[in-house]
């Protein structure tokens, strides 16, 4: 059962796993949620009745019964992890803590104009977990405006003390605000021989990479496959670091794979959710329960629904045995990974899907698309919305994309002459415009946020956000698309599609069925040659065939240019402008979304 509220002056007795330091009870709850075993916690706030050495302690706890006896204690705040909850979870913590010094290894000291600049520096430094900034009121003159970047083994402070005129905070890497590169390549037949901070067992290099991504100290990894010559090291995942942040030593070695933490791209690819099944593979660990199940999928469901289950092994039924049901072994370990992985015993293994809610919803796989044809099918572009105006009569105005449960990203030029958000309606999960009737449910628009540098589509900044009056419940037919990662600026997208209900030729009408067209991206240099009278800036991106024939057109504006990369769809562009439609040597011009990620996050994450 999901309990979100905090229990004041209450302490949970027993069940201790470990103690960490956090600046608030709220953050203690987040740390507990991300810990592989923590189900409950007790935080000690600062209080005259408490020993100062116990202030800010966050004791992570576990219990077989999922609860523990409660004891009254002043200054203690207790609560439950969000593991038991179904809502989306984020580790993003933008809070700034005044008069608190968060202790760690101070590895970098520099002057900064403000705490915000210090936090940005921390966010863009590969090693930084948190920072402390001495304000200009700090008593010691030589320490004023000093920004200390810090890291620890756990990613949380080793101690927190009160200190006047300083502020502390965390890196915003988990808020998708880092400019660090996102290197997704996995290098075959390569060992990184740098320092190991931990080792775990993993079924493949992808899981190893995801484990590295959410391990606070891991910057890159090496994985020994099941064909690795040394049996005792098969399926071993080595989590690594180095002073420079990059591997200093790459050695060619067959049956090993290496790669990098995906910390800088974690909002646009799954890093917690290990959804694959591993056939003829047994995961060893502490047994939680053995249950009868019809299939390995059913076994995974059982594991996902058992809050303490981390992974499972399913042994299929022997013929005509136990009504065709196999055995489902629900398991756990201290770090969330199997203690050993065995092959050739006939088991089917996998992980709980409970952690999937820690990933961005936009990374969820959607159903396979229909190749060929121009009409879309239901659920093919679940982020696409149709934006209607009701004035003077109701009609389709523009496209848009769901990027969050209360947010639509679209083009600024759609709102020319729109005086009030009250006349707007957002319809999601729509394939045919004819589905929209008087009684069709829609989302009202609470606010239109247009980029303040927008003047006209051709001069750029053609981007706007719609804040919805109510939240979108994600389903197969309405779900968000990922924003591109700032670290992905150099990615060459090859699978890009433009969608919309717009005209199919210059003089036409709005289409009934959502149309789709696969369109290649064009370099900005090439695009500039085609539009000599305009300035094609880096904040624009172009797409189109040299010979024309496929393009966005009137009515598609504001809709997505969606590109698939590493099995995840990204909102690379927003349909903005072009000369005519599908004309030869006149590519469509789109708002280059990656250049506006900071703006989007600033507006959507504002408190």
């Amino acid at each position: 059962e999901c309990v979100t509220q905090l229990l004041k002056d209450t302490c949970f007795e027993g069940g201790d796993i470990t103690t960490v330091f956090t600046p608030s009870a709220k953050y203690c709850q987040v740390v507990c949620t991300y810990h592989p075993r923590c189900l409950l916690f007790t935080f000690t706030a600062e209080s005259p009745s408490e020993d100062p050495t116990r202030w800010f302690t966050c004791v992570l706890k576990d219990s077989v019964t999922e609860t523990l006896p409660r004891v009254n204690r002043t200054a203690a705040i207790s609560g439950y992890s969000f593991k038991q909850c179904s809502h989306q979870i984020s580790a993003c913590n933008k809070d700034i803590y005044v008069d608190l010094d968060m202790k760690g290894i101070n590895y970098n000291s520099s002057v900064a104009k403000s705490a915000q600049e210090c936090q940005e520096r921390c966010t863009d430094d590969v090693h930084c977990h948190f920072f402390t900034y001495a304000t200009r009121q700090f008593p010691s003159l030589e320490h004023r405006n000093i920004c200390l970047l810090k890291h620890t083994q756990t990613g949380t402070p080793t101690r927190i003390t009160k200190l006047d005129k300083v502020v502390s905070g965390f890196s915003l890497k988990s808020c998708a605000l880092s400019n660090l590169a996102c290197i997704r390549d996995i290098f075959p037949n390569t060992v990184f021989a740098d320092s190991n901070i931990d080792s775990v067992m993993a079924p493949d290099a992808f899981v190893c990479g995801r484990i590295c991504t959410h391990h606070p100290g891991c910057l890159f990894f090496t994985f020994f496959s099941q064909e690795w010559p040394k049996e005792s090291q098969r399926n071993l995942c080595l989590l690594k670091t180095s002073e420079s942040g990059l591997p200093s030593t790459r050695i060619k070695k067959s049956k090993a794979l290496s790669g990098f933490s995906l910390q800088s791209c974690r909002h646009s690819i799954p890093v917690f959710c290990h959804s694959s099944f591993y056939h003829d593979t047994d995961f060893l660990g502490e047994e939680l329960d053995i249950v009868a199940a019809k299939s390995h999928e059913a076994c995974q469901k059982l594991c996902t629904n058992a809050v303490r289950c981390q992974f499972f092994t399913y042994t299929p039924a022997q013929a005509s045995c136990n009504e065709g049901k196999g055995k489902c072994y629900l398991k756990l370990s201290s770090n969330g990974s199997p203690t050993k992985i065995l092959h050739g015993r006939g088991g089917i293994s996998g992980y709980t899907l409970r952690l999937c809610k820690m990933d961005n919803e936009c990374t969820t796989k959607i159903k396979p698309r229909i190749v060929g044809g121009t009409a879309s099918v239901r659920g093919e572009w679940p982020w696409q919305v149709t934006l209607h105006t009701t004035s003077p009569t109701q009609r389709h105005l523009c496209g848009g994309s769901i990027i969050g449960n209360q947010w639509i990203l679209t083009a600024a030029h759609c709102f020319y002459g729109v005086e009030s958000p009250k006349i707007l309606r957002v319809y999601s999960g729509i394939l045919n415009q004819s589905e929209i009737k008087e009684d069709t449910s829609f989302f009202g628009v609470q606010e239109i946020i247009i980029h303040d540098q927008y003047k006209m589509a051709e001069s750029g900044y053609d981007i706007a956000l719609l804040k919805l009056e109510t939240t979108v419940n994600y389903t197969d037919s309405q779900r968000p698309i990922c924003l591109p990662s700032k670290g992905d600026r150099n990615v060459i997208y090859t699978d890009c599609w433009v969608t919309g209900w717009g005209y199919r030729k210059l003089r036409d009408k709005i289409q009934n069925t959502l149309q789709k067209a696969k369109i290649p991206l064009v370099t900005n240099e090439e695009c500039q040659k085609r539009y000599r009278g305009h300035k094609i800036t880096h904040k624009m991106i172009c797409a189109g065939y040299r010979e024309g024939g496929k393009d966005a057109c009137k009515g598609d504006s504001g809709g997505p240019l969606s590109c698939k990369h590493n099995e995840v769809w990204h909102l690379v562009g927003i349909t903005s402008w072009g000369e005519g439609c599908a004309q030869r040597e006149r590519p469509g011009v789109y708002t280059n979304v990656v250049e506006y990620v900071d703006w989007i996050l600033e507006k959507t994450q504002a408190v």
């Epitope: 990184f192 021989a193 320092s195 190991n196 090291q233 080595l238 690594k240 050695i251 070695k253």
Partner: nanobody
């Protein structure tokens, strides 16, 4: 019980040479990746050289052209021939088997199936 024993360390003048040996017991070199690591006082453990089971060799940039790694499988022994020694080569040298990287900067075992010797001190000083 796997044991790796280093020998050959000592005091040598700058420009001099030393040959380190590492002998293994309860363990065969044939299918193992062997390496020499070193740790100078106050520094992290660093990889000096590796010889892989398929005969490939690797050298850290700082020792390239001066150090040579080799092994004699019949004697279950690995060697590090160190020439043109410099003051900055002063460190404790460790022999390691199937050990790809140190444990958080220290020359100690960090994961299953990896082994370390006790180390031998090399001092380069005039």
């Amino acid at each position: 019980q796997v044991q790796l024993v280093e020998s050959g360390g000592g005091l040598v003048q700058p420009g001099g040479s030393l040959r380190l040996s590492c002998t293994a017991s309860e363990f065969t070199f044939d299918d193992s990746d062997m390496a020499w690591y070193r740790q100078a006082p106050g520094n992290e453990c660093e990889l000096v050289s590796t010889i892989t089971s398929d005969g490939g060799t690797y050298y850290a940039d700082s020792v390239k052209g001066r150090f040579t790694i080799s092994q004699d499988n019949s004697k279950n022994t690995m060697y590090l021939q160190m020439n043109s020694l410099r003051a900055e080569d002063t460190a404790v040298y460790y022999c390691a088997a199937d050990q790809w990287g140190s444990a958080e900067g220290d020359c100690t075992s960090s994961y299953p199936g990896g082994y370390w010797g006790q180390g031998t001190l090399v001092t380069v000083s005039s």
